[in-house]
């Protein structure tokens, strides 16, 4: 999987979009996970309502929340006040029985609020050396590595 | 148990090459990342590359670029480091150190490292 | 590459003691930080990682702070097997860069 950086600002929520196809994961539940390094275990955050034809309702676990259209074949998260440790590499998941298909590879990225001048020197600004090499702008707060890219292993 | 036992000390002169070995038990290397990290006597940490023993990709820091070589063995579950052109400097403590990558890793593992004197 | 640069290079303290150490990058490093502790002879030993997370097995007298360029190891209360040199390595890029070490010596 390619893996698609979503870049967020401190203090405001930040959506992450999932696209899959919805006849291929027709009736599966979702989940949204954080990964423990690139190829460490996926730890859940929170997944969909466990009734398939209830996923399009909003559950929170903290301050993320998941919600699925599974007729679009769109699974939203949304990690509402932003914080650095937020930021990390997470897995949206089409889950059967144990065993879980990944739907995308996501990294998120915390931006310094513009704003916060108190805080400015706490957070990364865009600009700075990024964490994968090379890669495209998707759209204003999402972007993929290119095909066949490799992200560096991160450090601990 | 989980360990990296690596290679014995070795002391080479001036010019000459060194292969340093790293073999992993209790764990594949192909779920990790291995890292090589230099301290040469009373001297700080000083991280060399790293290997995916899983597809073989690896990097190195500009300063050991061209001259060293991360290599891995996952049959015997052992990664390799060598290093050419040996100069007095290259003197140091060499430890491997495997972990899950980047963005939180929670495994750290190290070898007990190996010795390499650089003498004429 | 991305300097880092630790403070105080050492430091004599008493067991008991609420001991500091900072280490500041020169690049924007979000929370991709960890610290390690070194004793004379050993490989380093990972405390904490992601800037504030403590390590599976280390002691809660240990914490970690900060994030962006300002980083901070705090030992609550300093401990004899505590008596070592502590590392800050950044993992935001490649190629990973430690700090030159703070030794904690026995005051």
């Known amino acids: 999987h390619n893996t698609t950086v979503f870049q967020g600002v401190a203090g405001q929520s930040l959506q992450v979009s999932c696209p899959y196809d919805s006849m291929k994961h027709w009736g599966r539940r979702k989940a949204w996970c954080r990964q423990l390094g690139e190829k460490g275990p996926c730890q859940r955050v929170v997944s969909t309502h466990n009734l398939w034809l209830l996923s399009f309702l909003r559950r929170w676990n903290g301050s993320t929340a998941i919600t699925d259209d599974t007729l679009g074949g769109t699974l939203t998260i949304t990690l509402r006040n932003l914080q650095p440790h937020d930021a990390g590499l997470y897995q949206c998941q089409s889950l059967h029985g144990s065993e879980a298909d990944t739907l995308r590879k996501v990294l998120v990225e915390v931006l310094a609020d513009p704003l916060d001048h108190r805080d400015a020197g706490d957070l990364w600004f865009p600009g700075e050396s990024e964490s994968f090499e090379d890669a495209h702008v998707e759209h204003s707060i999402s972007r993929s590595l290119l095909e066949g890219e490799i992200p560096f292993p991160p450090t601990s | 148990q989980v360990q990296l036992v690596q290679s014995g000390a070795e002391v080479k002169k001036p010019g000459a090459s060194v292969k340093v070995s790293c073999k992993a038990s209790?764990?594949?290397?192909?779920?990790?990342?291995i890292h090589w990290v230099r301290q040469a006597p009373g001297q700080g940490l000083e991280w060399m590359g790293w290997i995916d023993p899983e597809n073989g990709d690896s990097k190195y820091a500009p300063k050991f670029q061209g001259r060293a070589t991360i290599t891995a063995d996952t049959s015997t579950s052992t990664a390799y480091m060598e290093l050419s052109s040996l100069r007095s400097e290259d003197t140091a403590v060499y430890y491997c150190?495997?972990?899950?990558?980047?963005?939180?890793?929670?495994?750290?593992?190290w070898g007990q490292g190996t010795l390499v004197t650089v003498s004429s | 590459d991305i300097q880092m640069t630790q403070s105080p290079s050492s430091l004599s303290a008493s067991v008991g003691d609420r001991v500091t150490i900072t280490c500041h990058a020169s690049?924007?490093?979000?929370?991709?930080l960890s610290w390690y502790q070194q004793k004379p002879g050993k490989a380093p030993k990972l405390l904490i990682y992601k800037a504030s997370n403590l390590h599976t097995g280390v002691p809660s007298r240990f914490s970690g702070s900060g994030s962006g360029t300002d980083f901070t190891l705090t030992i609550s209360s300093l401990q004899p097997e505590d008596f070592a040199t502590y590392y800050c390595q950044q993992g935001q890029t490649y190629p990973r860069t430690f700090g030159q070490g703070t030794k904690v010596e026995i005051k």
């Open positions: 150190h495997a972990d899950h990558g980047n963005y939180g890793s929670t495994m750290d593992y």
């Open positions: 209790g764990f594949s290397i192909e779920d990790f990342y």
């Open positions: 690049q924007h490093i979000n929370v991709w």
